[in-house]
Each structure stands twice: as structure tokens, then as C-alpha cells.
Amino acid sequence: LQDPCSNCPAGTFCDNNRNQICSPCPPNSFSSAGGQRTCDICRQCKGVFRTRKECSSTSNAECDCTPGFHCLGAGCSMCEQDCKQGQELTKKGCKDCCFGTFNDQKRGICRPWTNCSLDGKSVLVNGTKERDVVCGPSPADLSPGASSVTPPAPAREPGHSPQ
């Protein structure tokens, strides 16, 4: 025997107390599939959340975060304060990255600079609070007689001092 509730479309609920008639979901609630015996209460984007997509009778609202905050968790279940590049969020607020660490985003934690020597390379550009170090060629590559190809120095005309 077919369940009479299976005839109730999305956006309605099957009312057990009314001989299983299909009743529309009230405002600010939804059912995303047919045959449901209840409607889900719509998510409300309040406070630091803002509405990215309004709730409808067949789908939930979607939230994101107000400027200065970013989403965390599945479906933006939390909003976390942004920090500046070169900082990380602690229990006491945004704090500068310690020496030897960096953060190039407005979220997340400060990470240690890359240790170029672990890869046998030298530091080409020093790190900052906002940027990782840039590793250059290995010291062996810079030694005399190394096979790396370097362009010849431009010829100077006699009688001219270097610029």
C-alpha cells in the first residue's frame, strides 16, 4: 500500500492530524524533499552573520560573514574575526607573528619560515611577518666552475667608468 504522504511535494508537510493532507510549510520554514512529516525551521543569519541566500519553502537560508570576519565550519556555522597579514588570532585578539614565522593571509596561524638549508639551498630573500623566505640555488651551484649558465658581463668601452 502506498504511503499517502509520498504525494506531498517539497515545500509541504504531511499532516498526520489532518488525514495526511499536504499542508504548506509556514513562513520561515522549508521542506527540501517530498513526503516529509515536518518542515525545518529556516536558519536565521543574525549578528555577525549576513544572508547570502534567502530561505524559501524548499531550501534553507545560507549565511556568510559580515566584513572583517570569515566563515568557519560546514555551511559557515561560525564567523571568526579577520586579522592583518603578519598576524594571527589568539584568545586576546590579533597578535603579530613571532620572529621566524609568517602569515600571508587574514586568517589562520603564523607558520615557520621555510628552512632553506634543509633542501641544501641558500636564502635568496629574507622572510618577514607577512612573507616566507625565498630559497635560492644551493651554495654548490654558486661555487666557481659550477655548470650553471650565467650570461656574460656586458663589454665596457675603454675610458668609461662603471655606472
Partner: nanobody, 120 residues
Framework: EVQLLESGGGLVQPGGSLRLSCAAS????????VGWFRQAPGKGRQYVGT??????HYGDFENNRFTISRDNSKNTVYLQMNSLRAEDTAVYYC???????????????QGQGTLVTVSS
Amino acid sequence: EVQLLESGGGLVQPGGSLRLSCAASGRTFDNYAVGWFRQAPGKGRQYVGTYWSGYAHYGDFENNRFTISRDNSKNTVYLQMNSLRAEDTAVYYCAISLKYPMATVTPDYQGQGTLVTVSS
């Protein structure tokens, strides 16, 4: 932690009226449907009704004798009960859920209940 506190129960004569209140602490009712259930002595739990967003849904026993309403400013939901009968004697519980109606639902939170006795 959400706490629901029912009040307004007591002894009433058959044919009389009572208004039960349900107040929430720790959270507003804004995001929740609010329901009422009752449990008579020695009986199972029975669904009374659910309120959400201006709409009320009722159990199949009450025949328009019960009305659920809400006062947003007081963060309180009411159950107005008229033409009371002896068989309405029960502990009445307030509950909240993210589902509407709550007829087939286990609530997210439920209060301790208030006793209504209908007797002459």
C-alpha cells in the same frame, strides 16, 4: 544552556479556563518552533500543539479548545485552555525544536512541566 520554565498550572473546575506560560532563558525562541505536550497520570505523552512564525498546529484531540500564542517582547509562549474537562488533567510540558510541527518529533529541549488538575 537553554532552560524552559512552565507556569500557570493548578486546580480548575470542569468548564473552566487556564493559561499556561513557557519562558525561555539562555536563548530566545526566535530560531525555534515551540510546542506543548502533556502526560496524564499512567498514560503516554500526548502532542498538544506547535507554534511557529504566526502559525499554530494542534493535536487531534483538542477541538479548538486550546490556543497557542507568543509574546516576543517577553520571550514567552502561552497555551490558552478553555472548556477544560477532567480528561485534560495532566502535566503540561513546553518544548522547542527546529521542526514544525512537533507531532512526530523528539524536541531539542523540554521543560520540567506544570501540573493541571481539572476537578470539581
